[in-house]
Interface confidence: low
């Protein structure tokens, strides 16, 4: 656990020509704020995807208004720094938004209006518990100057706040089998209290309370054996091989978002559909009033003051949601042929052909096998003016990208277990049954004899992470 | 194409040090966890140690800690395995292996592994 801390040195203009006008008026006093939000890695996605690592808003800056005939100069600003808890391991690389916003402070009917002036994002490698890095972002004419780092909240220390540490109790040195914490030499690792029961032979853990399994060992307690050879099973005379993506619980499991929220899986994680009243990451946090500023990208903050009341964001155009946080997508109209990829880029949309397909929008048909990559094995087989992917055993689609489920039908009689494997399936047969696809009784005599399983995988063998 | 190609191995005798290399094309190694493998005549495969680029975190399985080191080098898009004080029952074919990002279930992250080299014979003999 630990804290991204940002320090905003300085918003302005920037230098060159075009000066850009103040955003503030005698007319018009106003103020700024800044929103910050962090997603883990080094990630290009859209501005408004989740903030999986968190988000902040500053408090608001002191009220300025433009004296006439001045340039604009730097704006007056909010004091103190924005605070990004993060409860699990700092992730050592980042993707950031900082978004400046100006609150007018005129007479508008139903209090202030907020627009976003300027949003400049990056992607940095930072690791914890170092010093302070200084950066300068341009959006448009405008600038931004500011710090930032990430800190481990004790007793967590180390570069990705991972290892916990305590002041020693002894003076002299640490415990039996405890390290001193480095770069503190005045404490020690903490030895960590993991779940009731983890096997001490077979498991560990790296944050209290959890059960992690050493190679060879599964189970919540890693108390169960595993073949060690599941998932590296030889496909070749020569080479480690593969076979290890099998379904894991999904994130939505158990619908971590709260207070009603609706949960929908992304590639990394979740994602909270928060009922009004309610936001944060699981939609934790509540009584979200228009003070708050919840409307994003320039949207209009309509409602009461009281932390009852509801507040309702009027969306500019392009923009979509309760806080007019989604961008309209103009890909869900499928304009890209051909299975082509669609990016919304906001000045224009544009289509990333798959091979075999060209054109604006992937309309026009390579029809040959030329510059043709089928994937995970398969072979590009051309005739009658088109062409095909022959796919192997375990792989299906258009170019064998999609990994075929051979249990999908279902296809172990009485109640026998099916585990996909890349060579295919296997049966793990109910008591009283046998047979490549569990279809024969045992004879009382035990005359039969099961059909051998593909290599690397026992019946019954459940697949592991690593 | 993604491809994973090994160097380094060879005859050693005990107690002596190898460095194996892991040279990645295809892909940036940056954006995944990258492991050695090592497979001895008889015995099942052994993950012996990963790396995750990203932050420098690594793992070792038992039978090697305080003797065997992995790296990674983003800008050569290579990744290495130093390994000291070698002894006879570590002879084996050594694999280079890439695990992708295949999720966040419960609290964490896991990675599954999806390619891996040819190998490179390591022998362990005097």
């Known amino acids: 656990a630990g804290v991204f801390e940002l320090q905003i040195h300085s918003f302005g203009p920037g230098p060159g020509p075009g000066a850009p006008r103040s955003p503030c008026s005698a007319r018009l006093p106003c103020r700024l704020f800044f929103r910050v939000c962090l997603k883990p890695g080094l990630s290009e996605e859209a501005a408004e995807s989740p903030c999986a690592l968190g988000a902040a808003l500053s408090a608001r800056g002191p009220v300025y208004t433009e004296q006439p005939g001045a340039p604009a100069p730097d704006l007056p600003l909010p004091d103190g720094l924005l605070q990004v808890p993060f409860r699990d391991a700092w992730p050592g690389t980042f993707s950031f938004i900082i978004e400046t916003w100006r609150e007018e402070l005129g007479d508008q009917i139903g209090g202030p209006a907020w627009s976003l002036l300027a949003r400049v994002a990056g992607r940095r490698r930072l690791a914890a518990g170092g010093p302070w890095a200084r950066d300068i972002q341009r959006a448009g004419a405008w600038e931004l100057r500011f710090s930032y780092r990430a800190r481990c909240e004790p007793p967590a220390v180390g570069t990705a706040c991972t290892r916990l540490c305590r002041p020693r109790s002894a003076p002299s040195r640490c415990g039996p089998g405890l390290r001193p914490c480095a770069p503190l030499e005045d404490e020690c690792e903490a030895p960590l209290v993991c779940r009731a029961g983890c096997s001490p032979e077979h498991g560990f853990c790296e944050q209290p309370g959890e059960c992690r399994c050493l190679e060879g060992w599964t189970g919540p307690l890693c108390t169960v054996p595993v073949s060690t050879s599941s998932c590296l099973s030889p496909r070749g005379p020569s080479s480690a091989t593969t076979g290890c993506l099998v379904p894991g619980p999904g994130p939505c499991d158990g619908n971590p978002c709260a207070n009603g929220g609706s949960c929908s899986e992304t590639p990394r994680s979740f994602e909270c559909t928060c009922p009004r009243g309610f936001y944060g990451l699981r939609c934790e946090v509540s009584g979200v009033t228009c003070a708050d500023g919840p409307c994003f990208n320039g949207g209009l903050c309509v409602g009461g003051a009281d932390p009852d009341s509801a507040y309702i964001c009027h969306c500019p155009p392009g923009f979509q949601g309760s806080n007019c946080e989604k961008r309209v997508d103009r890909c869900s109209l499928q304009p890209c042929r051909n299975g082509g990829l669609c990016l919304d880029l906001g000045h224009a949309l544009r289509c990333r052909c798959r091979a075999g397909f060209a054109g604006p929008r992937c309309e026009h048909d390579l029809d040959d096998c030329a510059g043709r990559a089928c994937a995970n094995g398969g072979t590009c087989v051309e005739g009658g003016g088109a062409h095909r992917c022959s796919c192997a055993l375990g792989f299906g689609g258009r170019d064998c990208r999609e990994r075929a489920d051979p249990c999908a039908a279902r296809p172990c009689a009485h109640g026998g277990r099916c585990y996909a494997h890349f060579s295919g399936l296997v049966c793990a047969c109910a008591p009283g049954y046998m047979g490549a696809r569990c279809e024969f009784p045992v004879h009382p005599d035990g005359a039969s004899a099961l059909p051998a399983a593909p290599p690397g995988l026992r019946p019954g063998d459940p697949q592991r992470y690593l | 194409e993604v491809q994973l190609v090994e160097s380094g191995g060879g005859l050693v005798q005990p107690g002596g040090s190898l460095r194996l290399s892991c040279a990645a094309s295809?892909?940036?190694?940056?954006?995944?966890?990258i492991g050695w493998v090592r497979r001895a005549p008889g015995k099942g495969e052994e993950l012996v140690a990963r790396i995750y680029p990203t932050n420098g975190y690594t793992r070792y399985a038992d039978s090697v800690k305080g003797r065997f080191t992995i790296s990674a080098d983003t800008s050569k898009n290579t990744a290495y395995l130093q390994m000291n004080s070698l002894r006879a029952e570590d002879t084996a074919v050594y694999y280079c292996?890439?695990?992708?990002?295949?999720?966040?279930?419960?609290?964490?992250?896991?990675?599954?592994?999806?390619?891996s080299g040819q190998g490179t014979l390591v022998t362990v003999s005097s």
């Open positions: 292996a890439r695990s992708s990002y295949s999720g966040y279930y419960g609290s964490h992250h896991y990675y599954a592994l999806d390619y």
């Open positions: 295809g892909f940036n190694i940056y954006d995944h966890s």
